[in-house]
Interface confidence: medium
Amino acid sequence: AVDLTLLANLRLTDPQRFFLTCVSGEAGAGRGSDAWGPPLLLEKDDRIVRTPPGPPLRLARNGSHQVTLRGFSKPSDLVGVFSCVGGAGARRTRVIYVHNSPGAHLLPDKVTHTVNKGDTAVLSARVHKEKQTDVIWKSNGSYFYTLDWHEAQDGRFLLQLPNVQPPSSGIYSATYLEASPLGSAFFRLIVRGCGAGRWGPGCTKECPGCLHGGVCHDHDGECVCPPGFTGTRCEQACREGRFGQSCQEQCPGISGCRGLTFCLPDPYGCSCGSGWRGSQCQEACAPGHFGADCRLQCQCQNGGTCDRFSGCVCPSGWHGVHCEKSDRIPQILNMASELEFNLETMPRINCAAAGNPFPVRGSIELRKPDGTVLLSTKAIVEPEKTTAEFEVPRLVLADSGFWECRVSTSGGQDSRRFKVNVKVPPVPLAAPRLLTKQSRQLVVSPLVSFSGDGPISTVRLHYRPQDSTMDWSTIVVDPSENVTLMNLRPKTGYSVRVQLSRPGEGGEGAWGPPTLMTTDCPEPLLQPWLEGWHVEGTDRLRVSWSLPLVPGPLVGDGFLLRLWDGTRGQERRENVSSPQARTALLTGLTPGTHYQLDVQLYHCTLLGPASPPAHVLLPPSGPPAPRHLHAQALSDSEIQLTWKHPEALPGPISKYVVEVQVAGGAGDPLWIDVDRPEETSTIIRGLNASTRYLFRMRASIQGLGDWSNTVEESTLGNGLQAEGPVQESRAAEEGLDQ
């Protein structure tokens, strides 16, 4: 249970001195933003018991694990339900305190009632100021039952609740009809989720037997110890004035825990501190009584005296709750009632004993279920006890059952039985399942059906490339999550196996069967850059791109060029199937169209990131091709071209474009504009001697037209001059070889 205590100071003569303090013994509790857990909350809960509004209460955080509520101005401020919330996550716990007005018409004989599922609960409201009207019982603020005023028994109104169930838990009140709700008797009923002495889902587990008024928690089987007691079974008393799960807290003020009510997590509820009783916890226990609310009786034997805080104080030579055990009789100390080990482990089991004469190593033995007796291999002797250590031979399944530790001395003997559970480490019955694969990773579902015992504490995934002799790589994963095997080699088969473990030494099971998982074709990670494009006709576009220089082989099968025609909402895809290509000619495009163009590297079916897009406007369709193009060499550096105008022109020609290229050459062609459209000849100058050239030309109106036929001609050798007429035209400004 969470170590959370709500203290109410019940010195009620002056409401302004009243305070509530919530104290947490949890690690990091209440520190809010500067530590792990959420802060402690302490507040008045007005949902069921509403009081007249008053000045706001003051909340003060003193230290990291304590919060105090003050600022009560009148007695009515105190009446009602207060709650403290502490602990983090699933351990978040609410502790509740119910305050009754001392001047109320009706007062509860006992405020907190903790009962077991199926029990009968009896709430008793004592008449403090009599009224001759009916008494209304309410449950969580809603009408529940009415009693006639003359149904009081011995000055008390009783509400019997047979066969209570957990939903019956809550705040109950008894009020005289037409009286102020502040004069009610308020009760808190806590119904454990199980019958007496049981806990857990289905209430199948046995409670440890909480001592000194401790209450067994129905969810986790732990004892919630009364204030002033500690230990797993509340067997140990704290020093006077101390409380908390480890007796770590101290009651404030010189009179210790007098006048304080302590509220603890359910199913404990509230009580006075150890050694005190009464409605305001100001009365010391009567002789022979001790503990919280003085509910426990000492019944000390053999000269023991009763201490109201801790119970029997035994004289020398005696021990036990009632000083009933002689120190001469040996006693086995603090032996766990149940131990768990994994199959084929060789655990060490300790057994501690005290007595007079003092037990020695040979006087303590361990007996297995089959009757085999083990002798201790070593013993640790301390002033108050001897601890014998037993080295258990390799465990087999038949070792499950009740073992016994026995101590024998001349003073007598004692034995303690405890249960040993031998568990079988889990072994996967199937191979892990492949969920998704990529080029460098595999996503695997590791948790498969298994033989042996749970719970599964860790899952190890072992993997290595198929047919490899290298060491297995291992990854430890959370049992409930899928696992991603990272940084794998692309297009590679991996052998993958699961190994399961359960808690404890030797909990690792054998490896499960292997399975083959293959990584995908790797993604092409390089992003191309579009470096240039030029229009080669109304429907043709030449595009060039580059790739970043990176070490290692190029991962890719080719390039995908995408042209998006936004006006028509059409996409054209062009596949360039060589990863070495850096240029492409796109043909069959729509003249006069605005295209958005990008390029991506692809590998298998995977596309890499796209280049930044380029925006290209193709010219509208141009005129037909010029006719009868003819070339004639004039000299070693000049060739004359002649042609006829195209037929059926849609408009006036703005210019001609001549393309010149060295025959068999690999360089880009040179384009020369002929700006006088009425001409039908031009001289191309600045050519190389004795060189063969290819020529073609086209006309332009709004856009460039179709190319003419290609003609070939060679320049003359050095010094040879051709004869014939020469017609001037604008020629190239630079030589083609520059």
Partner: antibody, heavy 120, light 107 residues
Framework: EVQLLESGGGLVQPGGSLRLSCAAS????????MVWVRQAPGKGLEWVSV????????GYADSVKGRFTISRDNSKNTLYLQVNSLRAEDTAVYYC?????????????WGQGTLVTVSS | DIQMTQSPLSLSASVGDRVTITCRAS??????LAWYQQKPGKVPKLLIY???TLQSGVPSRFSGSGSGTDFTLTINSLQPEDVATYYC?????????FGQGTRLDIK
């Protein structure tokens, strides 16, 4: 050591223009694409523009298309952003960053930024 | 354009907590996603690239996962120096959009 240093920011009236520069050193500038990213005061990061290593290709966010022009001078190892027709919503710190060359898609190298304030 | 949506836009957590920030793309972006950390008055710092690869020099408590449209940045044990705004950015196609940012502070 790779360094990127922006300059050219300042106070400008709505409709005005500025030319931002980013001087690069410590790497072969002509081998890398470059980007501009901006961040309005108290707001998130906004991608603005990209230019290819040779300068032959550029890209822009819709919010700046037609008003901003990215360019580069590889001989001077300098990236530019010409910002025209400025609006109040263009007020931001403008960062230049080196685009990845492949594989590690993320901007590792950033300049310290230059502040552009558009106000009348 | 591809939209990147981060959630939550701000969060408070305690030192030692495991913190998760998610980023969702309006269409599939493969693994082309980066995560950045930006502290007040500083330039963004690249933490994770290609969705899950830790940038050299970044503490191993940071990790990234996801592909397609859904991505996650996880800080395994939050430290005081992790107070910052975190951004995701897609690199699948232009413009290379950023998420709105997630502001992280300590409770």
């Amino acid at each position: 050591e790779v360094q990127l240093l922006e300059s050219g920011g300042g106070l400008v009236q709505p409709g005005g223009s500025l030319r931002l520069s980013c001087a690069a050193s410590g790497f072969t500038f002509s081998m890398y694409g470059m980007v501009w990213v901006r961040q309005a005061p108290g707001k998130g990061l906004e991608w603005v523009s990209v230019i290819s290593p040779s300068g032959g290709n550029t890209g822009y966010a819709d919010s700046v298309k037609g008003r901003f022009t990215i360019s580069r001078d590889n001989s001077k190892n300098t990236l530019y952003l010409q910002v025209n027709s400025l609006r109040a919503e263009d007020t931001a710190v403008y960062y230049c960053a080196r685009a990845p060359r492949g594989y590690s898609y993320g901007y590792y190298y950033w300049g310290q930024g230059t502040l552009v304030t558009v106000s009348s | 354009d591809i939209q990147m949506t981060q959630s939550p836009l701000s969060l408070s957590a305690s030192v030692g907590d495991r913190v998760t920030i998610t980023c969702r793309a309006s269409q599939g972006i493969g693994h082309y996603l980066a995560w950045y950390q930006q502290k007040p008055g500083k330039v963004p710092k690249l933490l994770i690239y290609t969705a899950s690869t830790l940038q050299s020099g970044v503490p191993s408590r940071f990790s990234g996962s996801g592909s397609g449209t859904d991505f996650t940045l996880t800080i395994n044990s939050l430290q005081p120096e992790d107070v910052a705004t975190y951004y995701c950015q897609q690199f699948n196609s232009y413009p290379h959009t950023f998420g709105q940012g997630t502001r992280l502070d300590i409770k």
